[in-house]
């Protein structure tokens, strides 16, 4: 049963999907494996707070501590990465704040910025001093656990020396790692003692061992790769938007709704209205009117602009966003003041939100 009655037939035109969605990211909290993470639920007046991770209820356990508005994760692991939400349940409504947790090793992002110093890793020995292989830069090998988002590039390094110059080969899960073992293969840069895998996928998860050897000995080092995936999810609305606003009669005002969605989002701006002097229909549900929605004839649906407002425009404005997975909505109040009273903006409203691709 829908939770409102529409005042008029709001049959929507078919949508013209954009080539890319205008999205803004939820806040991201990054932690290295083994670290502890504390996040405060950024919602006000919360009587009861409940937590979810990737849509599943999150309860306390030996590593997860929930105290009031705080979530603590002790000894974070890549499995803790995901989309988190805290929901504040109040007597009249509930509000949800979303954030991402990424337990990842930044070194494994695959940037080659540290490859410029590769020459120091390639140590030439005096030909008379025969020497078994040894590590030349153990600092670059300290992080054994690499948690990387899917589609990123991963680089593992084993800088070594020895005389004669050792050779390097790579194993995956203890077996010879062949090019055909992954789509797109991989690169080995012997100069830099590195293994590079581009656009990692879940099947790349596992243990990667570099074996460095010459005729005088062999050394090895193992890295563990975890590929962190994210499933598609319902839209996320940036906390605090739309923001409450006030203006004088005859003034103009804008409400902004910042949307983050994996899939085509459908945006509606809805207002509580009266019909025949009543705010509620015979079924007890409030009357709502769709003021604007995304579609062919709607530009910049994330912004609702009201011009030359009257006192009748005062009230609650709801930004409701849905995709095939689910929906989310947040609202703001418009206060309309008499002309002689100067408006006190409760929050600055920006007409052009910053969107991240």
């Amino acid at each position: 049963r829908p939770s409102f009655s529409l005042v008029e037939d709001t049959t929507l035109e078919p949508e013209e999907p954009p080539t890319k969605y205008q999205i803004s990211q939820p806040e991201v909290y990054v932690a290295a494996p083994g670290e502890s993470l504390e996040v405060r639920c950024l919602l006000k007046d919360a009587a009861v707070i409940s937590w979810t991770k990737d849509g599943v209820h999150l309860g306390p356990n030996n590593r997860t501590v929930l105290i009031g508005e705080y979530l603590q994760i002790k000894g974070a692991t890549p499995r803790d990465s995901g989309l988190y939400a805290c929901t504040a349940s109040r007597t009249v409504d509930s509000e949800t704040w979303y954030f991402m947790v990424n337990v990842t090793d930044a070194i494994s992002s695959g940037d080659d910025e540290d490859d410029t110093d590769g020459a120091e890793d390639f140590v030439s020995e005096n030909s008379n001093n025969k020497r078994a292989p040894y590590w030349t830069n153990t600092e670059k090998m300290e992080k054994r656990l690499h948690a990387v988002p899917a589609a990123n590039t991963v680089k593992f390094r084993c800088p070594a020396g020895g005389n004669p110059m050792p050779t390097m080969r790579w194993l995956k899960n203890g077996k010879e790692f062949k090019q055909e073992h992954r789509i797109g293969g991989y690169k080995v840069r012997n100069q830099h003692w590195s293994l590079i895998m581009e656009s990692v996928v879940p099947s790349d998860k596992g243990n990667y061992t570099c074996v460095v050897e010459n005729e005088y000995g062999s050394i090895n080092h193992t890295y563990h790769l975890d590929v962190v995936e994210r499933s598609p999810h319902r839209p996320i609305l940036q906390a605090g938007l739309p923001a409450n606003a006030s203006t004088v009669v005859g003034g103009d005002v804008e409400f902004v709704c910042k949307v983050y969605s994996d899939a085509q989002p459908h945006i509606q701006w809805i207002k509580h209205v009266e019909k025949n002097g009543s705010k509620y229909g015979p079924d007890g549900l409030p009357y709502l009117k769709v003021l604007k929605h995304s579609g062919i004839n709607s530009s910049n649906a994330e912004v609702l602009a009201l011009f030359n407002v009257t006192e009748a425009d005062a009230g609650e404005y709801i930004c409701k966003v849905s995709n095939y997975i689910g929906q989310a909505n947040q609202s703001a109040w418009l206060t309309v003041l008499p002309k002689q009273q100067a408006p006190g903006r409760e929050k600055e409203i920006t007409a052009s939100p910053d969107y991240l691709e």
């Epitope: 829908p2 954009p18 599943v56």
Partner: antibody, heavy 114, light 107 residues
């Protein structure tokens, strides 16, 4: 783990109605749409519609308006589809699926027969 | 309604072969396309979402590509257990529509 449980089969008479259930567990029921999909040998897969259990919002395929009614009960985490004025054309397997289509029920086989 | 035209309707392949199935949308759907595997007596299984993202636990021999109106689903190294009907679906605009399906048979 996430599960959607549906009854295995329903046999109904032409002209009658049938109401099928889809009980969800392992996730927060109110935060995902529940989709309903029809499968017939001739027609392949057809999306009937979806419901957002948190507020009861529904979206229907026009082809099923008047034929299918979607409801949800938050207290039992169960979604329902009611099919009315049944004919042999309605004999099919009806699946429910979570909003992301990553989890599906086993399907209910509806047979319309005298 | 957006029509998803899937081809071919059926194909017979040998183990180890590479299979490609195409899906053409009657209007642009950005990258809002999913691919499913449907085996007899089983529910559909999500393989690919958002055109190219492999769902959790799906083997990497399954890949998807494309955007706008033209989409391709590929099985790079067909296995005997891949015998099934494969469907594309657009989830951009309601009603969410499926392609007619491609039946993959193993020689």
């Amino acid at each position: 783990q996430v599960q959607l449980q549906q009854p295995g089969a329903e046999v109904v008479k032409p002209g009658a109605s049938v109401k099928m259930s889809c009980k969800a567990s392992g996730y927060i029921f109110t935060t995902y749409n529940v989709h309903w999909v029809k499968q017939t040998p001739g027609q392949g897969l057809e999306w009937i519609g979806s419901i957002y259990p948190d507020n009861g919002d529904t979206s229907y395929n026009q082809n099923f308006k008047g034929k299918a009614t979607l409801t949800a009960d938050k207290s039992s985490s169960t979604a329902y589809i009611q099919l009315s004025s049944l004919t042999s054309e309605d004999s099919a397997v009806y699946y429910c699926a979570r909003g992301d289509f990553a989890y599906w029920g086993q399907g209910t086989l509806v047979t319309v027969s005298v | 309604n957006i029509v998803m035209t899937q081809s071919p309707k059926s194909m017979s392949m040998s183990v180890g072969d590479r299979v490609s199935i195409t899906c053409k949308a009657s209007q642009g759907v950005s990258n809002d396309v999913a691919w499913y595997q449907k085996k007899p007596g089983q529910s559909p299984k999500l393989l690919i979402y958002s055109a190219s993202y492999r769902y959790t636990g799906v083997p990497d021999r399954f890949t998807g590509s494309g955007s706008g109106t033209d989409f391709t689903f590929t099985i790079s190294n067909v296995q005997a257990e891949d015998l099934a009907v494969y469907y594309c679906q657009q989830h951009s605009t309601t009603p969410y529509t499926f392609g007619g399906g491609t039946k993959l048979e193993i020689k």
